[in-house]
Interface confidence: medium
Amino acid sequence: QVQLVQSGAEVKKPGASVKVSCKGSGYTFTSYWMHWVRQAPGQRLEWIGEIDPSESNTNYNQKFKGRVTLTVDISASTAYMELSSLRSEDTAVYYCARGGYDGWDYAIDYWGQGTLVTVSS
Amino acid sequence: DVVMTQSPLSLPVTPGEPASISCRSSQSLAKSYGNTYLSWYLQKPGQSPQLLIYGISNRFSGVPDRFSGSGSGTDFTLKISRVEAEDVGVYYCLQGTHQPYTFGQGTKVEIK
């Protein structure tokens, strides 16, 4: 079955960078876009961006452009999200999630378990 | 960015009774070729979100048929015909028609 397994929780200082990984299994990794979404305490879910693993095409939320980099390692069926210049408001649970087409419609269907990133001095 | 507004924010329900959640978008979510990328998710306490409905009204595999989605353009609705205890959590709508994709603020369904 489809599984997305993310790396463990991270604690970072303001100004630092964090890199979260997401390993996909149970499906053809290169056939589905990988999205990244975050959820800050008490906030709504926020879409960060997406990457097409087959060609590494990316689309980013302008809010994060310049600070976020999405990459993939196809040989390891793993996607990465790196966020730099961290600030306290980046404290959130970060999710990877698969985006796929099915019968003409597109949806983000399967989600990772989430990675808590805490930014604190 | 497209703003997604859900109502109500909190919904106390009695098991066996119906429930309805509204989601409105600040602009039309209809694609030029006819489809609408509007989906619904349930985030149960302590879990990741799970897909319930995509393309306005298509139930994702394994989702009970008590869940149904409807709407068009800017107005969408998620209905639960008979709420069960396992349905508690926060429900989110998501639009994937325009980048950046945006979520509603969530509707918390709790048992009375």
């Epitope: 019968g103 597109y106 | 393309g55």
Partner: antibody
């Protein structure tokens, strides 16, 4: 394997009506949007109608809007195209096609021929 | 409607040699969701069309990797690295970004 078999094509007079059918097998029909696409005698392809998996949503190009109606019976795994006020320019091979991954038609039937002529 | 213009109309190739077909759209096919809905189909003689490539460059299952799709915006290309006898037929490009979805006029690939 996925199979789509069209039927109902015929010779019809201008202004006449006809209903095409498409029997689907080899996949969960109720999970997929479906379309009708036609190929004119000069081999040009033209999209004619689409319907969502549950049948709630339908779409048509202006060339057939108001004259053609797409429908489906998920219990019978069958897609339909009801055509009325037919014109000579509707003469074509009509294909039913499944909406597949990535938006577009991944599987097509073998086609059924409609000829509109007096 | 978006006009899809394919060139050449006919392409005579030798087995084992490469082939390239161009498809130009009258407006950009980049959608508001960040995707480009451009597909390629092959209609072999006496058969119905079969999709080869979707989303510009993604190969359908079972399609040999000698086929590649590329391009962006309004200019797209289908390449066959080494033509085989089974590749002959008419190739069509298709766009699903704008309503109504439209096809190119076709490129007939024949063996020299």
């Amino acid at each position: 394997e996925v199979q789509l078999v069209e039927s109902g094509g015929d010779l019809v007079k201008p202004g006449g009506s006809l209903k095409l059918s498409c029997a689907a097998s080899g996949f969960t029909f109720s999970s997929y949007g479906m379309s009708w696409v036609r190929q004119t005698p000069d081999k040009r392809l033209e999209w004619v109608a689409s319907i969502s998996s549950g049948g709630s949503y339908t779409h048509y190009p202006d060339s057939v809007k108001g004259r053609f109606t797409i429908s489906r019976d998920n219990a019978k795994n069958t897609l339909y195209l009801q055509m009325s006020s037919l014109k000579s320019e509707d003469t074509a091979m009509y294909y039913c096609a499944r909406h597949g991954t990535g938006v577009g038609f991944d599987y097509w039937g073998q086609g059924t021929t409609l000829t509109v002529s007096s | 409607d978006v006009v899809m213009t394919q060139t050449p109309l006919t392409l005579s190739v030798t087995i084992g040699q490469p082939a390239s077909i161009s498809c130009k759209s009258s407006q950009s096919l980049l959608d508001s969701d960040g995707k480009t809905y451009l597909n390629w189909l092959l209609q072999r003689p006496g058969q119905s069309p079969k999709r080869l490539i979707y989303l510009v460059s993604k190969l359908d299952s079972g399609v040999p990797d000698r086929f590649t799709g590329s391009g962006s915006g309004t200019d797209f290309t289908l390449k066959i690295s080494r033509v085989e006898a089974e590749d002959l037929g008419v190739y069509y490009c298709w766009q699903g970004t704008h309503f109504p979805q439209t096809f190119g006029g076709g490129t007939k690939l024949e063996i020299k």
